[in-house]
């Protein structure tokens, strides 16, 4: 079920106009310290680095793009779900 949701989000993200994808600064894609429990297990960046990235939405980290994306709560839109629908 979650996999379907992930695929759905990835389709939306990949089909979005470039400005619609909330992508962080390029330098944030550089070397990262490997944190997390267990060998080679990385924590979801949405839980720390991008914890407050989405204003009225939920953060979803798209591994393929190495960038966070926001799923907006009802009535909100924009790359960080900051805009209110009229």
């Amino acid at each position: 079920d979650l996999q379907e949701a992930d695929l759905d989000l990835l389709r939306v993200t990949l089909s979005s106009k470039p400005q619609a994808l909330a992508t962080p600064n390029k330098e944030e894609h550089g070397k990262r310290k490997k944190k997390g429990k267990g060998l080679g297990k990385k924590r979801d960046p949405c839980l720390r680095k991008y914890k407050d990235f989405c204003i009225h939405g939920e953060c979803k980290y798209v591994k393929e793009l190495r960038a966070p994306s926001c799923i907006c709560h009802p009535g909100y839109h924009g790359e960080r779900c900051h805009g209110l629908s009229l």
Epitope: L2, S16, H56, G57, C59, P74, H77
Partner: antibody, heavy 122, light 113 residues
Framework: QVQLQQSGTELARPGASVKLSCKAS????????ITWVKQRTGQGLEWIGE????????YYNEKFKGKASLTADKSSSTAYMQLSSLTSEDSAVYFC???????????????WGQGTTLTVSS | DIVMSQSPSSLAVSVGEKVTMSCKSS????????????LAWYQQKPGQSPKLLIY???TRESGVPDRFTGSGSGTDFTLTISSVKAEDLAVYYC?????????FGAGTKLELK
């Protein structure tokens, strides 16, 4: 499989408070919203409010502000709704439901709990 | 608040009949960002929890029989059951998720003639 297990029937006195629970399983709790809906006997569905466990954001129907308080415990994948200053008007079945998303937006409820019946009587 | 109006309030049908019910919103539910209508349909049988049938006005939820079809745009929406079965007797609710507060219609009760 996705399941929402709600707490059992509640009987409460006028003026008291109750805390209803909704335990989620079968999916990543923080990825979806949990919404609460009221249904009085023989009546329609009334949206109370919702919580997004991931961000902690809550949204309320103005009518239920001060009446309902929504919280979520990520460690146990459980959402709660506290109802205060109970009156007979609060007697109803309360449903929790998972708020799902597609195309980048949340908004519709794809899995529902079995409902908790609350009776307020002296 | 967005007001959702459903009609008729009740509908008496025979098994095998085609049925349509209406849901109207007090303002457009069309999201300009994705050109989709933020409307869902639910079925509730007596003593049961509601069940999602349709979202984005016309997308059928997984596992829902294809006799259920959602259509419409803007403020006018329709749920059609192409050939009613006895198990379809229930109350049907529409719900908007265009903006808060989320609101439901009063429901259409499908009864046996």
């Amino acid at each position: 499989q996705v399941q929402l297990q709600q707490s059992g029937t509640e009987l409460a006195r006028p003026g008291a408070s109750v805390k209803l629970s909704c335990k989620a399983s079968g999916y990543t709790f923080r990825t979806y919203g949990i919404t609460w809906v009221k249904q009085r006997t023989g009546q329609g569905l009334e949206w109370i409010g919702e919580i997004f466990p991931g961000s902690g954001n809550t949204y309320y129907n103005e009518k239920f502000k001060g009446k309902a308080s929504l919280t979520a415990d990520k460690s146990s994948s459980t959402a709660y709704m506290q109802l205060s200053s109970l009156t007979s008007e609060d007697s109803a079945v309360y449903f929790c439901a998972r708020e799902s998303f597609s195309d980048g937006y949340y908004g519709y409820f794809d899995y529902w709990g079995q409902g908790t019946t609350l009776t307020v009587s002296s | 608040d967005i007001v959702m109006s459903q009609s008729p309030s009740s509908l008496a049908v025979s098994v095998g009949e085609k049925v349509t019910m209406s849901c109207k919103s007090s303002q457009s539910l069309l999201y300009s960002t994705n050109q989709k209508n933020s409307l869902a349909w639910y079925q509730q049988k007596p003593g049961q929890s509601p069940k999602l049938l349709i979202y984005w006005a016309s997308t059928r939820e997984s596992g829902v029989p294809d006799r259920f079809t959602g259509s419409g745009s803007g403020t006018d929406f329709t749920l059609t059951i192409s050939s009613v079965k006895a198990e379809d007797l229930a109350v049907y609710y529409c719900q908007q998720y265009y903006r808060y507060p989320l609101t439901f219609g009063a429901g259409t009760k499908l009864e046996l003639k």
